[in-house]
Each structure stands twice: as structure tokens, then as C-alpha cells.
């Protein structure tokens, strides 16, 4: 089968109430079939590529475990399995200040060096 291209799928928006939790869905495809090398998953807020990171985790070669390196205020937790092309993120104890746009990103290292980030992101509406 032909190699897949990089793509990311996120919904335009997610709505939730302050104090509740929300899930920011993000799935991706990539051209590196059977990739099992080092992987980093990142979520940032505000703007793509340059916005501040709110979550980051890293998985070692051959591992499905994406070890959390950053979770802003301890409120961000990865639900998706990056090895299954899913970066879905759970945000706990929502505050009005969380009402912004969020962007998911995945990075491959090791034998393959490649990365991809959602351009449009998902808008989180907190009411």
C-alpha cells in the first residue's frame, strides 16, 4: 500500500464548563510505516509552532509509554496512545483562562527525524 502522508485531524472546537474536564481529540497519519523509534508528543496553546507548551511527553524506542515531561499545573493528561497515532489530551479542572486554541504536535527522532503540527488547532470554549 502507498505510504500515507503527514496529516492531523482535530475538531474545530470543544466546549466545556469551568471546573469540568474536557478532551481535546487529535489523531494523525504519517509516512514512516512501522516506526517504533523515539517519539515526543506536544500540545501548545495560543498559536502553532510558537505558542507556550502546556503538555509534553516522550516515549523511548520500542515503548508505548509516553512519559510526561510537562503538564502545566498538573492538569493535562494524555489519553491517546501516540503509538496508535492518537494524541488526544484531557484537561482537568477547567478555568476561564483555558479558553484558547490548542495545537498538537508529534516528533520522531532516532533513525527517522520528522515532525508535524496541527496548523489550525482545536478551539476550547470554556463557559
Amino acid at each position: 500500500s502507498p505510504a500515507q502522508r503527514w496529516s492531523m485531524q482535530v475538531p474545530p472546537e470543544v466546549s466545556a464548563e469551568a471546573g469540568d474536564a474536557a478532551v481535546l481529540p487529535c489523531t494523525f497519519t504519517h509516512p514512516h510505516r512501522h516506526y517504533d523509534g523515539p517519539l515526543t508528543a506536544i500540545w501548545r496553546a495560543g498559536e502553532p509552532y510558537a505558542g507556550p507548551q502546556v503538555f509534553r511527553c516522550a516515549a523511548a524506542r520500542g515503548s508505548e509509554l509516553c512519559q510526561t515531561a510537562l503538564s502545566l499545573h498538573g492538569r493535562f493528561r494524555l489519553l491517546g496512545n501516540p503509538r496508535r497515532n492518537d494524541l488526544s489530551l484531557r484537561v482537568e479542572r477547567l478555568a476561564l483562562a483555558d479558553d484558547r486554541r490548542y495545537f498538537c504536535r508529534v516528533e520522531f527522532a532516532g533513525d527517522v527525524h520528522d515532525r508535524y503540527e496541527s496548523r489550525h488547532g482545536v478551539r476550547l470554549h470554556v463557559t
Partner: antibody, heavy 121, light 107 residues
Framework: QVQLVQSGAEVKKPGASVKVSCKAS????????VSWVRQAPGQGLEWMGV????????GYNEKFKARVTITADTSTSTAYMELSSLRSEDTAVYYC??????????????WGQGTLVTVSS | DIVMTQSPDSLAVSLGERATINCKAS??????VDWYQQKPGQSPKLLIY???NRYTGVPDRFTGSGSGTDFTLTISSLQAEDVAVYYC?????????FGQGTKVEIK
Amino acid sequence: QVQLVQSGAEVKKPGASVKVSCKASGYTFPRYDVSWVRQAPGQGLEWMGVIHPGSGGTGYNEKFKARVTITADTSTSTAYMELSSLRSEDTAVYYCARRGLNKGYWFFDFWGQGTLVTVSS
Amino acid sequence: DIVMTQSPDSLAVSLGERATINCKASQNVGSNVDWYQQKPGQSPKLLIYESTNRYTGVPDRFTGSGSGTDFTLTISSLQAEDVAVYYCMQSNFFPFTFGQGTKVEIK
């Protein structure tokens, strides 16, 4: 050949802790994730958490996060699962399982024989 | 957490007949479902991974299918040694979650 050999059955009182071991052989222990899965009597399977022995990184099911600690000793190729504040509902067979992979697919390819933990006053 | 619901809970099939077990996920889990067989007093054993891939040494009478939310394990011609409980498991989301199990018996 790959083998996971677990420690023997345990009887514990409510409120106590238990530590179950899982000794691996036949493969390079630090490279593969090891998960712990439990099965209450006559019930289904429940994933508790995972460790990557090479890095020592762990991930837990939120249900158990406050009470479970998973560790690994690469010098002896042994993974451990410690569960604290035991209650009667923790009576179960506890399994370790290797998370093998093939061409970018992960799966539980080898399981320990199971360790029965009985919690009773 | 993702809920995996198997049907039926138990199944009695004549030797040589087909057995079909269904597994429904509470949300889309792609093709990230494995099937495990557990015989009485034994540890689970891997049958199928990634929905359709038969694990090494597993007889070809075992077939997996499905994606998204609906998955099926089929035993095309039931043998006596297939008496066991069968579990589906999703690994698309953490925590990994299993179905409640389907007990397969001989009619």
C-alpha cells in the same frame, strides 16, 4: 525462550501492602514495556499500569494511581508491582505481561503465570 | 475510560461449527483491538492483534475483523481445545481496557 515467572501467592490483611515480582528471561529486559493486569475471581481483566524498564518511566490507570507503584530492577530483569491500602476487593490474580512489538504493532505476547493475592481479615 | 462490551456473554457451539464473538467500543478506537484466549486456570494468550493480524502459531480458524467501534472474532470450525473465555482489548487510549469476556463451550 521468553519467560515471565511471578512470585508466589500472598495472603494479606485489609490495610496492608503487597509486592509481587515478575522475573523475565529470554529477552533483553530493558527494551520492552511490562504491564500489570489483574483478574478478580470469576471476573474479567483490568489493566493497572506499565513500566519501561530501560528508562524507569511508569504509567498508571487513574483508578489505581494513588495505591500502586510499579518498579523494575534491570540488574535482575525483574519487575515489581506494589499495591497498598489493600481491601477485600483487591483479592485477585495479578499478572505481569510483556508488551511485545512487531513492525510497529504492540501486543501482550508473553504473560506471567499469575500471583493470587487474597485480602482477608 | 473506553468501555468494551462483548456479546454474547456465553456461547455454546457444536464441534466443527462456527463461533462468532462481537466486541463494541464506546468510541472509535481505530483498528487497535487485540483478542486474547484464556483457558481455565491459565494465563491469557494472544490470538489476534491490531484487529485482523493472527499472532504467530495461532491456527487459521481464528479470524479477527472490524474497525472503529465494532469488532468480531470468528472461530470458523470449533475444536475441543477452543473451550475458553475470550477477551477483546483496546489499546488506542489509556487506560487499556478489556471486554467482560465471552465463554465459549461445546454444545
